[in-house]
Amino acid sequence: KESCDVQLYIKRQSYHSIFAGDPFKLECPVKYCAHRPQVTWCKLNGTTCVKLEGRHTSWKQEKNLSFFILHFEPVLPSDNGSYRCSANFLSAIIESHSTTLYVTDVKSASERPSKDEMASRPWLLYS
């Protein structure tokens, strides 16, 4: 029997290497059964996750999963950091793992590094 708990499918310690000035969509895959829960995004500030208010968000529906999307239009250097989505379901809060955005400011990068170059940076390796 399939569990009817809400589940948020963000991988633990996942990250995205993105560039300032580009558009970016941060997706929170949500599995639910009958009623779609209310989902929000927050940004980590130390141990506190600050709810993101007034941001452009949307839903995308696929076969077995819905995606709650946070839109960056465009990405700003200040968007660097860790984000978490959470769902309000039957008066309980279900929190996802956090996912980290590493923003490269194109003004300070002579050319866009490859994925392997991104991975070779110590601040990526040990974050």
Epitope: Y9, I10, S14, H16
Partner: antibody, heavy 119, light 112 residues
Framework: QVQLVQSGAEVKKPGSSVKVSCKAS????????MYWVRQAPGQGLEWIGR????????RYAQKFQGRATITADESTSTAYMELSSLRSEDTAVYYC????????????WGQGTLVTVSS | DIQMTQSPSSLSASVGDRVTITCRSS???????????LNWLQQKPGKAPKRLIY???KLDSGVPSRFSGSGSGTDFTLTISSLQPEDFATYYC?????????FGQGTKLEIK
């Protein structure tokens, strides 16, 4: 059930490279992390690095930075680990493993690939 | 890097014995989500390692209930309540909290 099958044993010359493959079945690798660990003869386990097959981002232990390259091909559910500038100390059994990226609910290892570096 | 130190490095015991292996990390394994990502592996000669326990105390499916894990912060233990012949192997702890992942040096469990 989740299974991993690795490529066969290799004998390599010092200074050359080796590329080991690891094919997963029973799981969508987009939902996992795949990682590589080695074990020199009679020694303990040493973590090399891991990849997120959903986006291709890899992370490495500092010791292997610049010498190891981990990649994944989602279409064939296969991960690869290439190690360059081989030396005799790289002689080891290389294991790939896969685990659930969301809840760590499974962790499965391949059978291992013996890489011998000898002139 | 986080150092993982296991003790003892080898241990002789008999079938039916209760055995405890300890693992100490050089810093706390408590992650920001409130969980400690500490795993225990079993490896038999010539075979690949197999995970027995994850998140300190959760048993992998198919692992006999005589195996248990406990601990928090920096100190963890693997206990086998009543040794069976198939339990003689090498056991490793390893941490999945921080990069790079690191392993203990192993504990070889031998028949007395």
């Amino acid at each position: 059930q989740v299974q991993l099958v690795q490529s066969g044993a290799e004998v390599k010359k010092p200074g050359s490279s080796v590329k080991v493959s690891c094919k997963a079945s029973g799981v969508n690798i987009k939902d996992t992390y795949m990682y590589w660990v080695r074990q020199a003869p009679g020694q303990g386990l040493e973590w090399i690095g891991r990849i997120d097959p959903a986006n291709g981002y890899a992370r490495y232990a500092q010791k292997f930075q610049g010498r190891a390259t981990i990649t994944a091909d989602e279409s064939t559910s296969t991960a690869y680990m290439e190690l360059s500038s081989l030396r005799s100390e790289d002689t080891a059994v290389y294991y790939c493993a896969v685990y659930d990226g969301y809840y760590e609910s499974f962790d499965v290892w391949g059978q291992g690939t013996l890489v011998t570096v000898s002139s | 890097d986080i150092q993982m130190t296991q003790s003892p490095s080898s241990l002789s015991a008999s079938v039916g014995d209760r055995v405890t292996i300890t693992c100490r990390s050089s810093q706390s394994l408590l992650d920001s989500d409130g969980k400690s990502y500490l795993n225990w592996l079993q490896q038999k000669p010539g075979k690949a390692p197999k995970r027995l326990i994850y998140l300190v105390s959760k048993l992998d499916s198919g692992v006999p209930s005589r195996f248990s894990g406990s601990g928090s912060g920096t100190d963890f233990t693997l206990t086998i309540s009543s040794l069976q012949p198939e339990d003689f192997a090498t056991y490793y702890c390893w941490q999945g909290t921080l990069f790079p992942r690191t392993f203990g040096q192993g504990t070889k469990l031998e028949i007395k």
